[in-house]
Interface confidence: low
């Protein structure tokens, strides 16, 4: 009696079980009563990553340099190419189909987390006692200068965008 189901790594066709092609190979012809499944390796720019009965291999992903992409891991006959973003850019999506430049933190904000190839810069407002006077993708909020440690006094208070201004203490006359 012909089978209704096949073992793992097999498929049912014309009332018989044929072997699937292994990863990295595509199906050329199904098995028959007298011949085994015929498979062929994928070409250099193609891949198949599962046991399959595909008649065409998949094209490797193209890491488009004009979209800021570069190859992180070259594809093989069994794996797709993995793209990542060039330095200074990060992916716009999980599948990393294009990249955008890292955001800069504006004055009054500092970098909480530096951007990576897959995540943007995370900025945070400078808390009281800290400032940032630059637009930067890597500078944290800096602490206000401590005038006291320099034997000076605060002449102008700091803000989230400016440092304090220190000046000499007024000398008391006798």
């Amino acid at each position: 009696e012909p089978p209704t189901a096949c073992r793992e790594k097999q498929y049912l066709i014309n009332s018989q079980c044929c072997s699937l092609c292994q990863p990295g190979q595509k199906l050329v012809s199904d098995c028959t009563e007298f011949t085994e499944t015929e498979c062929l390796p994928c070409s250099e720019s193609e891949f198949l990553d599962t046991w399959n009965r595909e008649t065409r291999c998949h094209q490797h992903k193209y890491c488009d340099p004009n979209l800021g992409l570069q190859v992180q891991q070259k594809g093989t006959s069994e794996t797709d190419t993995i793209c990542t973003c060039e330095e200074g850019l990060h992916c716009t999506s999980e599948s990393c189909e294009s990249c955008v430049p890292h955001r800069s933190c504006l004055p009054g904000f500092g970098v909480k987390q530096i951007a990576t190839g897959v995540s943007d810069t995370i900025c945070e407002p400078c808390p009281v006692g800290f400032f940032s006077n630059v637009s930067s993708a890597f500078e944290k909020c800096r602490p206000w200068t401590s005038c006291e440690t320099k034997d000076l006094v605060v002449q102008q208070a700091g803000t989230n965008k400016t440092d304090v201004v220190c000046g000499p203490q007024d000398r008391q006359r006798a």
Epitope: N66, S98, P101, R103
Partner: antibody, heavy 122, light 108 residues
Framework: QLQLQESGPGLVRPSETLSLTCSVS??????????WGWIRQPPGKGLEWIGS???????YYNPSLKSRVTISVDTSKNQFSLKLNSVTAADTAVYYC??????????????WGQGTMVTVSS | DIQMTQSPSSLSASVGDRVTITCRAS??????LNWYQQKPGKAPKLLIY???SLQSGVPSRFSGSGSGTDFTLTISSLQPEDFATYYC??????????FGQGTRLEIK
């Protein structure tokens, strides 16, 4: 010197497909340095980017038009084409083809064709 | 999509005037901003790319500045051939490339 020249019918009926071709002379399109794009300008209005094609077959479209647009690049003929289906009067515009330079992401259209007026009317 | 807003929509000026056109992006676009000039019946012409770089062959009276969300195009001394419509365009987050609505520069 690089030149781009649009060609195609100046009148298209509503609901039909607008087809334009851009012929490139003075340089090979078979290069990874440029995208080949289409931009349109309705009478008296501003510029709207339609999409771009790349020599390897990659295409990038304006999401607002994506469902109706096909751009293809034929490097053997040094041409690229635009197809816009299901047109309405709102698609009446001057259509420009352009070479786009990368600043990484699909960049500045820096060399343009002279434009061709397409009217959608019955 | 990133929206680009130009101001003013139109302005009148005289030959020799210094003219400034501004462009604002709906979110930060770093320096990924370009400026175009378009004359009636003609294709746009790239003047400035990457916010402040002058395209080859463009007169030095044109200059661009800004980064983030606010940008300006300045013509230091207006010439008769400068009367045209000017567009800004972002290429930071694409597709799509987006243009400003244009600024029409007329003779006073």
């Amino acid at each position: 010197q690089l030149q781009l020249q649009e060609s195609g019918p100046g009148l298209v009926r509503p609901s039909e497909t607008l087809s334009l071709t851009c012929s490139v002379s003075g340089a090979s399109m078979n290069t990874n340095n440029y995208y080949w794009g289409w931009i349109r300008q309705p009478p008296g209005k501003g510029l709207e980017w339609i999409g771009s094609g790349y020599y390897n077959g990659n295409t990038y479209y304006n999401p607002s038009l994506k469902s109706r647009v096909t751009i293809s690049v034929d490097t053997s003929k040094n041409q690229f084409s635009l197809k816009l289906n299901s047109v309405t009067a709102a698609d009446t515009a001057v259509y420009y083809c352009a070479r786009q330079t990368p600043p990484r992401i699909i960049g500045s259209p820096n060399i343009w064709g002279q434009g061709t007026m397409v009217t959608v009317s019955s | 999509d990133i929206q680009m807003t130009q101001s003013p929509s139109s302005l009148s000026a005289s030959v020799g005037d210094r003219v400034t056109i501004t462009c604002r992006a709906s979110q930060s676009i770093s320096s990924y901003l370009n400026w175009y000039q378009q004359k009636p019946g003609k294709a746009p012409k790239l003047l400035i790319y990457a916010a402040s770089s002058l395209q080859s062959g463009v007169p030095s009276r044109f200059s661009g500045s800004g980064s983030g969300t606010d940008f300006t195009l300045t013509i230091s001394s207006l010439q008769p051939e400068d009367f045209a419509t000017y567009y800004c365009q972002q290429s930071y987050s694409t597709p799509p490339i987006t243009f400003g609505q244009g600024t029409r520069l007329e003779i006073k």
